[in-house]
Interface confidence: low
Amino acid sequence: YDFTNCDFEKIKAAYLSTISKDLITYMSGTKSTEFNNTVSCSNRPHCLTEIQSLTFNPTAGCASLAKEMFAMKTKAALAIWCPGYSETQINATQAMKKARKSKVTTNKCLEQVSQLQGLWRRFNRPLLKQQGSSDYKDDDDKHHHHHH
């Protein structure tokens, strides 16, 4: 899906009002320094691409995020504010229904949600720079802290 046509300000509002709080709730009890951010994004469409992937694509050790409150609200925000997004997600919805119903919060899931928090913060104010470039005066570290 091409996220360049989304209404970023509306999605940002949804994040600030509810999604961010749900992410914090999910991470409650986890030390803010426990996980390092390894997933990055440089523009808001790119951030949404990464957010969608981490939120809805099952990964090894963490298959249950799609049923979490923050995921459902993320899905709703994308469906409402990204034209044509819903149509592309029919197969993904079927896969989500087949996911196991029990909510098991594994360490892998906590790490994944920690990455999501970082991506959402970058979506909120994108870094606007490619990662790993040594030719420029960049210091990304301050953007990698967790705020819980």
Epitope: T4, S42, N43, P126, L128, K129, Q130, Y136, K137, D139
Partner: antibody, heavy 117, light 107 residues
């Protein structure tokens, strides 16, 4: 409405440092990055670098690392670019422009710098 | 660094004609490309961003498109106020780079 008001034209001697200002109004200054772009007479546009007004983090291309210094004054919502030891090669129009996703939706009116002895 | 090759460098056309300006990126920049118009002695003005999204207030005779690493700006039914210089710019990441520009003149 959003405005980026730049300082007026400047005539400087070679070697004398010069500072160009860009006063922002009509939006939250710290939400957008401020970029600087150079345009020599009759030439195209050249990206110099950018500054994040919220924490003054800067990114400059190699060519301008020893030439340009970018700063901001949050209290007055003003961005500055200082050019050190200017030569005739630095004679150009300099623009500030704001961005969130990398494209420039608002530009300053430009500051013409003339370096001449 | 990503290089942006813009063509043609100059173009003569008459009011009412349709013109297309192209820009090729040296590597994949997806849809991260903007187009600007600049009149003599004035600041550039944003026309298109994300390759095909029209900026606020830009007439619908302007349109952007993308095919791989080639980007196009099409101006239908040229108006007198459309003459000037046009620049493409990638906004995929640092360093931002611009195309060399296209000067659109009245025939």
């Amino acid at each position: 409405q959003v405005q980026l008001q730049q300082s007026g034209p400047q005539l400087v001697r070679p070697g004398a440092s010069v500072k160009i200002s860009c006063k922002a109004s009509g939006y939250s200054f710290t939400t957008y990055w401020m970029h600087w772009v150079k345009q020599r007479p009759g030439q195209g546009l050249e990206w110099i670098g950018m500054i994040d007004p919220s924490d003054s983090e800067t990114t400059l291309i190699q060519k301008f690392k020893d030439k340009a210094t970018l700063t901001v004054d949050k209290s007055s919502s003003t961005a500055y670019m200082q050019l050190s030891s200017p030569t005739s090669e630095d004679s150009a129009v300099y623009y500030c422009a704001r961005t969130l996703d990398g494209y420039y939706d608002y530009w300053g009116q430009g500051t013409t710098l003339t370096v001449s002895s | 660094d990503i290089q942006m090759t813009q063509s043609p460098a100059s173009l003569s056309a008459s009011v009412g004609e349709t013109v297309t300006i192209t820009c090729r990126a040296s590597e994949n920049i997806y849809s991260y490309l903007a187009w600007y118009q600049q009149k003599q002695g004035k600041s550039p003005q944003l026309l298109v961003y994300f390759a095909k999204t029209l900026a606020e207030g830009v007439p619908s005779r302007f349109s952007g498109s993308v095919s791989g690493t080639q980007f196009s700006l099409k101006i239908n039914s040229l108006q007198p106020e459309d003459f000037g210089s046009y620049y493409c710019q990638h906004h995929y990441g640092t360093p931002w780079t611009f195309g060399g520009g296209t000067k659109l003149e009245i025939k």
